[in-house]
């Protein structure tokens, strides 16, 4: 007990009344007003509770404190008086804060700040919406994926920030009068092939497809190694080059060098280069036959095989390349005497004559083209004087009936053996490769070396044998007339031709040798 008469056991937040009693401090309450035992407690009174008589007024909040309370302006409001806290409604000076004015960047990009009582909202620009997880942030609305399908089916929707476009799909274009972009855009397929908007390589032909196009190898061409056909990036090579390779089993550096040149030309070939490529091939052939190098060391039969292979391949390559030439007449000649004459025309109804130094060819234009082939008609003649180097002692195989006739009118083949090649070897070709049976014959007039008197002159062609070699033959070719240095031949097919002098001894005047010129 306190001598001054005050209880020393009063609980927390209370004060003594006398030596035996205590009372809770203001803002606290106990079960009874006067506390007489130390077991009782003083608890904080929540002045802000709903039944409380405290009223802070509008735009404010009541904050309970230990033993007391404070009135404060609600968020988004501030006191005009400047006092942060107050005790009752009469002291309340709270008014709305304009956050939009205080902080213009409150709504970040693409939104507009709108002040509200005690707060603000962000209003998004057209094409934007509030982000659910951050209601103050406007994000782009993807109209293309929102299920609105705002574009016509011929277009594709292109979302961009705050907007979208209806663009023609690749390979399509706006229909006449339609815009390209707005939501009323309507498109139609572009024919890239006829409009020239394609990227097809010149070795291919453009084919239009819905909304796109593809590039296919030209007829007679194949895709380059590893590149598929029918793609936009398809690149093709002329098959004629790929098949013209050295004959198997022939070992010659000179020939290998020639075919290396041919393959290089094939690799670099584009139809626009047809003229140059033809010239380069003939230049290479001219050089090969001017200087056959180690071909001279090959056995005779192999030399004939090489000649056969060169003649066959040259004809195919020239036929293929000449289809890409423009209309007109071409003449090329080379140092060693190789000569090419070519005429390219759209179908014409007349005969064509190709003239060269040592040979003239005459035939009907309508032989040149296969029916149904839309390309130009080509007639070509190549004179290859040097080919005779490889055809020395090449055999002549006569049809049995011609053999018999010769034995009747001549004493027989002299012991000297192989016939002599009098003329250049010439090769004739058409765009039409089906030339085994011409509807009207072709006529050749050869200039050649002098004929030894009393020797038989024959018009012959080179027949490519099954073994890849060949021989001279007369089937389908007849000698129309001959004199000392010229002979006229008529044939019902095309190939490589020449005039031979066979070692027959003519016994009496031979009607076949009579001049018909």
């Amino acid at each position: 007990q306190d001598s001054r008469g005050c209880a020393r056991w009063c609980p927390q937040d209370s004060s003594c009344v006398n030596a035996t009693a205590c009372r809770c401090n203001p803002g606290f309450s106990s079960f009874s007003e006067i506390i007489t035992t130390p077991m009782e407690t003083c608890d904080d009174i929540n002045e802000c509770a709903t039944l409380s008589k405290v009223s802070c007024g509008k735009f404010s909040d009541c904050w309970n404190t230990e033993g007391s309370y404070d009135c404060v302006c609600s968020p988004g409001y501030e006191p005009v008086s400047g006092a942060k806290t107050f005790k009752n409604e009469s002291e309340n000076t709270c008014q709305d804060v304009d956050e939009c004015q205080q902080n213009p960047r409150l709504c970040k990009s693409y939104g507009t700040c709108v002040n509200t009582l005690g707060s603000y909202t962000c209003q998004c620009l057209p094409g934007f919406k509030l982000k659910p997880e951050d209601p103050k942030l406007c994000t782009d609305v993807n109209e293309c994926t929102s299920g609105q399908n705002p574009c016509h089916s011929s277009t594709h929707c292109l979302n961009n920030v705050g907007s979208y476009q209806c663009r023609c799909r690749p390979g399509w274009q706006p229909i006449p009068g339609s815009p390209n972009g707005p939501n009323n855009t309507v498109c139609e397929d572009v024919d890239e092939c006829s409009s020239g908007q394609h990227q097809c390589d010149s070795s291919t032909v453009c084919f239009n497809t819905v909304g796109s196009y593809s590039c296919r190898c030209r007829p007679g061409w194949k895709p380059r190694h590893g590149i598929p056909n029918n793609q936009k990036d398809t690149v093709c090579e002329d098959m004629t080059f790929s098949t013209w390779t050295p004959p198997p089993g022939v070992h010659s550096q000179t020939l290998s060098r020639f075919f290396d040149k041919v393959q290089d030309l094939g690799r670099d070939y584009k139809p626009g280069l047809a003229n140059n490529t033809i010239q380069s091939i003939l230049q290479a052939l001219d050089e090969l036959l001017e200087a056959p190098g180690d071909l001279e060391t090959l056995p005779r039969l192999q030399q004939h095989c090489v000649a056969s292979h060169l003649l066959d391949g040259l004809e195919d390559v020239l036929r293929g390349l000449s289809k890409n030439l423009s209309n007109g007449l071409l003449n090329f000649s080379y140092p060693a005497g190789t000569e090419l004459s070519l005429e390219v025309q759209k179908q014409v109804d007349r005969s064509v004559t190709l003239r060269q130094n040592q040979a003239v060819m005459q035939l009907d234009w309508n032989q040149a083209q296969k029916s149904g082939d839309p390309g130009p008609s080509v007639v070509g003649l190549v004179s290859i004087p040097g080919m005779g180097k490889l055809l020395a002692e090449a055999p002549l195989v006569l049809e049995p009936e011609k053999q018999m006739l010769l034995h009747e009118t001549h004493q027989g083949l002299l012991q000297d053996g192989s016939p002599i090649l009098l003329s250049d070897v010439i090769s004739a070709f058409l765009s039409n490769n089906d030339t085994q049976n011409l509807s009207s014959p072709v006529t050749f007039t050869f200039s050649h070396r002098s004929v030894i008197p009393r020797q038989k002159v024959l018009c012959v062609f080179w027949e490519h044998g099954q073994n890849g070699c060949g021989h001279w033959a007369t089937t389908g070719c007849s000698t129309i007339g001959t004199r000392d240095t010229s002979t006229i031949c008529r044939c019902t097919h095309l190939s490589s031709f020449a005039v031979l002098m066979a070692h027959y001894d003519v016994q009496e005047e031979d009607p076949v040798l009579t001049v018909i010129t």
């Epitope: 001017e290 200087a291 056959p292 190098g293 001279e296 060391t297 000649s333 080379y334 140092p335 060693a336 005497g337 130094n357 040592q358 004087p385 180097k389 020395a392 002692e393 070396r449 030894i452």
Partner: antibody, heavy 118, light 107 residues
Framework: QVQLQQSDAELVKPGASVKISCKVS????????IHWMRQRPEQGLEWIGY????????RYNEKFKGKASLTADKSSTTAYMQLSSLTSEDSAVYFC???????????WGTGTTVTVSS | DIQMTQASSYLSVSLGGRVTITCKAS??????LAWYQQKPGNAPRLLIS???NLETGFPSRFSGSGSGKDYTLSITSLQTEDVATYYC?????????FGGGTKLEIE
């Protein structure tokens, strides 16, 4: 008629160069190759090379590469041969010739004597 | 290179006699051979092409023959105007090569 007229004889010093000409007439200059031959005193003939006037295409005997250079002027129908770094070994008569239909020489020039002497 | 060998550098034959000049190639030249006649102080003149073809302007007493590697120029009934040097030339391969020449004299 077909003629190949060559330039006159030349006397040149060792190490010098000489250019001899061959004027063609009587045939189409661009249709045939023009060949050059050398004939040293009391010796045989050697083929030097040719020029094809149509496109200026040339071909040389390996032995004469670097020694002879062939050119042609279509407007004057003249073929030329320049010989460089001359030594006494190059003293010879030089002939130009027209190639026949095959690779023999059917018409020859008059010949130009080149003498290399100090 | 193909070597052309003319066995005789000189041949002395009596007037009206028969002459045979030979030419041998180091490889087959398949008749791609020419013969030339060169008179002193003149350019060579094409005499025979393709081993057997006599050029116009030469009399028929000149003839050529042969095959493979071996070739022959024959002159029957030799005349004084035939005194000259005769050369063979192969045109099968580049470089074109000539024989060393055969000088014909009258004994």
């Amino acid at each position: 008629q077909v003629q190949l007229q060559q330039s006159d004889a030349e006397l040149v010093k060792p190490g010098a160069s000489v250019k001899i000409s061959c004027k063609v007439s009587g045939f189409s200059f661009t249709d045939h190759t023009i060949h050059w031959m050398r004939q040293r005193p009391e010796q045989g003939l050697e083929w030097i090379g040719y020029i094809y006037p149509t496109d200026g295409n040339t071909r040389y005997n390996e032995k004469f590469k670097g020694k002879a250079s062939l050119t042609a002027d279509k407007s004057s129908t003249t073929a030329y041969m320049q010989l460089s770094s001359l030594t006494s070994e190059d003293s010879a008569v030089y002939f130009c010739a027209k190639r026949g239909y095959y690779w023999y020489f059917d018409v020859w020039g008059t010949g130009t004597t080149v003498t290399v002497s100090s | 290179d193909i070597q052309m060998t003319q066995a005789s550098s000189y041949l002395s034959v009596s007037l009206g006699g028969r002459v045979t000049i030979t030419c041998k190639a180091s490889d087959h030249i398949n008749n791609w051979l020419a013969w030339y006649q060169q008179k002193p102080g003149n350019a060579p003149r094409l005499l025979i092409s393709h081993a057997t073809n006599l050029e116009t302007g030469f009399p028929s007493r000149f003839s050529g023959s042969g095959s493979g590697k071996d070739y022959t120029l024959s002159i029957t009934s030799l005349q004084t105007e035939d005194v000259a040097t005769y050369y063979c030339q192969q045109y099968w391969n580049i470089p074109y090569t000539f024989g060393g020449g055969t000088k014909l004299e009258i004994e």
